[in-house]
């Protein structure tokens, strides 16, 4: 056969679906690889062909579209399972071709089992809600295209294993779950089960997401430098190790990049000749506020080093701050015998 543009196995799109539920999988060619859509390709006389490789097999085989009740079907650029079975797991390929053109891509599909409390190996999307902020909502994800708008599905929401019906701050409103207030106690996994009829059969779609309650923008402040501060003086003798921690608190801010850095005499440590090492550690509060500590270390400090300016800088979407460390050379203690001798006029 003639050459085919093979985009290989697209592992970026690891698709996971639940066993015994409908699944609609769009051919990734039109989503991510080609500059035209299925309609354009179809009008140009191109044909979309599907085949698959079963789990732990090397043999590519055609997909059986003649199963009872059309369990697997193709509609335009979508491969449909009504419903999936565990042994549908494998690598699926969609190939677009005519006599002069060919392009194909493979992607892994994993059919996953869930228990009665919706626990499964499924990777869960995370939705962040601001703490004590007012009405916020989560939406049952990835249910578009499964049923026409004329069909009114039944939606049931669960937190963990429990049906949500009398949680005082959480209100199920169809495809949305509304939080009148979000509290730390609302952290957890939320599942929507969408039930809809189709051709005399009833199908269920199960979607789980993780809710993480984070710091509210109402309470967000610019970075706060806890150390260095005016109360601590780093007093060292030449030859000793100088350790200065820069500890900065950052309020949680959605999509904010938090940065901490040191300057020595106005320059980044990489741009000067001193032998400096900087170690960073990061910790988070329950609402994802962040504390970053960068420890500046000079193993054997010189008297020159003790005259330099050491400034800790911090930046977030809320602003930039800086604080200089108080560094000084320790005055050596008087050596008793010499002082005494001088006092008696000895030479």
């Amino acid at each position: 056969s003639e050459r085919c543009d093979d985009w290989g196995l697209d592992t970026m799109r690891q698709i996971q679906v639940f066993e015994d539920e409908p699944a609609r999988i769009k051919c990734p060619l039109f989503e991510h690889f080609l500059k035209f859509n299925y309609s354009t390709a179809h009008s140009a006389g191109l044909t979309l062909i599907w085949y698959w490789t079963r789990q732990d097999r090397d043999l590519e085989e055609p997909i059986n579209f003649r199963l009872p009740e059309n369990r697997i079907s193709k509609e335009k650029d979508v491969l449909w399972f009504r419903p999936t079975l565990l042994n549908d797991t494998g690598n699926y390929t969609c190939m677009l071709r005519n006599t002069t053109y060919c392009s194909k891509v493979a992607f892994p599909l994993e059919v996953v089992q869930k228990d009665s409390c919706f626990n499964s190996p499924m990777k869960l999307p995370v939705h962040k809600l601001y703490i004590e902020y007012g009405i916020q909502r989560i939406t049952c994800p990835n249910v578009d295209g499964y049923f026409p708008s004329s069909v009114k599905p039944t939606i049931t929401w669960y937190m963990g294993c429990y049906k949500i019906q009398n949680f005082n701050n959480v209100i199920p409103e169809g495809m949305n779950l509304s939080f009148l207030i979000a509290l730390i106690s609302n952290n957890g996994n939320y599942t929507c089960v969408v039930t809809y009829p189709e051709n005399g059969r009833t199908f269920h779609l199960t979607r789980t997401l993780t809710v993480k309650v984070v710091g509210s923008p109402k309470n967000a402040v610019p970075p706060v430098i806890h150390s260095p501060n005016d109360h601590v003086v780093y007093e060292k003798e030449p030859g000793e190790e100088l350790l200065i921690p820069c500890t900065v608190y950052f309020s949680f801010l959605m999509d904010s990049r938090n940065e901490v850095w040191w300057t020595i005499d106005g320059k980044k440590p990489d741009d000067i000749t001193i032998d400096v090492t900087i170690n960073e550690s990061i910790s988070h509060s329950r609402t994802e506020d962040e504390t970053r500590t960068q420890i500046l270390s000079i193993k054997k400090v010189t008297s020159e080093d003790l005259k330099r300016s050491y400034v800790c800088h911090a930046r977030s979407a809320k602003g930039e701050v800086a604080k200089a460390a108080k560094v000084k050379q320790k005055v050596p203690a008087p050596r008793y015998t010499v002082e005494l001798a001088c006092g008696f006029g000895a030479t």
């Epitope: 004590e132 007012g134 019906q165 701050n169 209100i171 207030i181 109402k218």
Partner: antibody, heavy 117, light 110 residues
Framework: SLEESGGDLVKPGASLTLTCTAS?????????MCWVRQAPGKGLEWIAC????????TYYASWAKGRFTISDTSSTTVTLQMTSLTAADTATYFC???????????WGPGTLVTVSS | ALVMTQTPSPVSAAVGGTVTINCQAS??????LAWFQQKPGQPPKLLIY???TLASGVPSRFSGSGSGTEFTLTISGLQSDDAATYYC????????????FGGGTEVVVK
């Protein structure tokens, strides 16, 4: 239980603050506390709610915004400040809360506010 | 704003009979509806929440049904103690007024 206090006979244009006191529980875990009123011989009318014990997330009926203010003043009291009172505000004012996540499950006996010249 | 409309009022039935009260929401409020009973000189009492779930301690002769915009409270095996005014309460977070009571329905027991 809940108990309202502060109801009084006031003149039109006056201000008044009603207090709802909880006994047997405190608002530390963000209780949903609401005020509802009932004019003599009329139906129930929702005024406002607050998540007491939190950062004071509040919800108001559109007609009550601006003239009525709900707030939590301690771990066991919620107040309703009312300004520019008119005869139409004459009613029994109830404080209602949730228990076990059920809205308006717990009610106080009510306090009467009469606005008359 | 969310508007709750209750019908009919008043409604009367004999002891042992059945009474049906309807409540219509101006918006699709799914199952976010509660029913209350109020007797003269008393605060309201929660009977049903989430449209059909009986509140604790409420007799099983009270039942609720419906979802979306149409809801019903049914009192079967009517007792003289059931003479009261009944209110529905809708919850709708998309409205400026997230809570709204119906106008009330008086039940008279003959």
């Amino acid at each position: 239980s809940l108990e309202e206090s502060g109801g009084d006979l006031v003149k039109p244009g006056a201000s008044l603050t009603l207090t709802c006191t909880a006994s047997g529980f405190s608002f530390s875990s963000s209780y949903y506390m609401c005020w509802v009123r009932q004019a003599p011989g009329k139906g129930l009318e929702w005024i406002a709610c607050i998540y007491a014990g939190s950062s004071g997330v509040t919800y108001y009926a559109s007609w009550a915004k601006g003239r009525f203010t709900i707030s939590d003043t301690s771990s066991t009291t919620v107040t309703l400040q009312m300004t520019s009172l008119t005869a139409a505000d004459t009613a029994t004012y109830f404080c209602a809360s949730e228990t076990d996540g059920n809205y308006f499950n717990l009610w106080g006996p009510g306090t009467l506010v009469t606005v008359s010249s | 704003a969310l508007v709750m409309t209750q019908t009919p009022s008043p409604v009367s039935a004999a002891v042992g009979g059945t009474v049906t009260i309807n409540c219509q929401a101006s918006e699709d409020i799914y199952s976010n509806l509660a029913w209350f009973q109020q007797k003269p000189g008393q605060p309201p009492k929660l009977l049903i929440y989430r449209a059909s779930t009986l509140a604790s301690g409420v007799p099983s002769r009270f039942s609720g049904s419906g979802s979306g915009t149409e809801f019903t409270l049914t009192i079967s095996g009517l007792q003289s103690d059931d003479a009261a005014t009944y209110y529905c309460l809708g919850v709708y977070t998309y409205s400026t007024d997230i809570h709204a009571f119906g106008g009330g329905t008086e039940v008279v027991v003959k």
